[in-house]
Interface confidence: medium
Amino acid sequence: FERTRSLQDPCSNCPAGTFCDNNRNQICSPCPPNSFSSAGGQRTCDICRQCKGVFRTRKECSSTSNAECDCTPGFHCLGAGCSMCEQDCKQGQELTKKGCKDCCFGTFNDQKRGICRPWTNCSLDGKSVLVNGTKERDVVCGPSPADLSPGASSVTPPAPAREPGHSPQ
């Protein structure tokens, strides 16, 4: 199959990094600057992606591969292939339309991106709160009272049952 195609199509001999130049009797010409071909036999080279503004170059474009972008400090990638850069927030915050906002009570975010998530509801698993949650950290659940040996007790009393997303104060 490939052998017959090579006989039919002189362009199939052009390797990656070149293009089959119809203006020059179908000889293989190198890709011009800022372009690439990642497979052989191409009639044109593809334009390199340019990492401008809030994007920065993670991998330079070469004659055989496209550039790859990431984001400048203070921003993080979103979307396939880092198609967008989104502003970082501090831990304990989330990004809203009005900028970075502190997590509401009962929620936390331990990253510089993403949304605030509700503290774990220890009582749903029959456990007690060992360490209280903060804006930056989830609660730490301890063993259930039944798991404790006689005389032992948890740091805080068992959490009462409550709606998801709420936590003991």
Epitope: D9, S38, A39, D46
Partner: nanobody, 126 residues
């Protein structure tokens, strides 16, 4: 998981038109070249055309130039094949395929592509 799903095939009369779609999921669609191939009964898979990652350059096989147009919408993760002036010899199963990030093979050979859809049948008959 990488997935490609073609749709839009069907039966059409000679001279008619069809638009095929290829919905991609599970990977960075906008970073890869994409191609359409077809396979008629008893024949080998044939390259139709290929579109660059950003839609900036295209390659077509001679037999479809001026009749078929490939386009893509990176926001919708979808590749399209607009077919017009269809002929009986265009009857085949049509496949979309993702171009490898590097291949030593010719752009028109199947080996240059690493993921394929399941195909959609196009029948051209009076």
């Amino acid at each position: 998981e990488v997935q490609l799903l073609e749709s839009g095939g069907g039966e059409v009369q000679p001279g008619g038109s069809l638009r095929l779609s290829c919905a991609a999921s599970g990977w960075a669609f906008g970073n890869y070249g994409m191609a359409w191939f077809r396979q008629a009964p008893g024949k080998e898979r044939e390259f139709i055309g290929r579109l660059a990652w950003n839609g900036g350059s295209t390659d077509y096989v001679e037999s479809v130039k001026g009749r078929f147009t490939i386009s893509r919408d990176n926001a919708k993760n979808t590749l399209y094949l607009q077919m017009s002036s269809l002929r009986a010899e265009d009857t085949a199963v049509y496949y979309c395929a993702r171009q490898r990030s590097y291949s030593r093979y010719d752009i028109r050979t199947p080996q240059t592509y690493d993921y394929w859809g399941q195909g959609t049948l196009v029948t051209v008959k009076p």
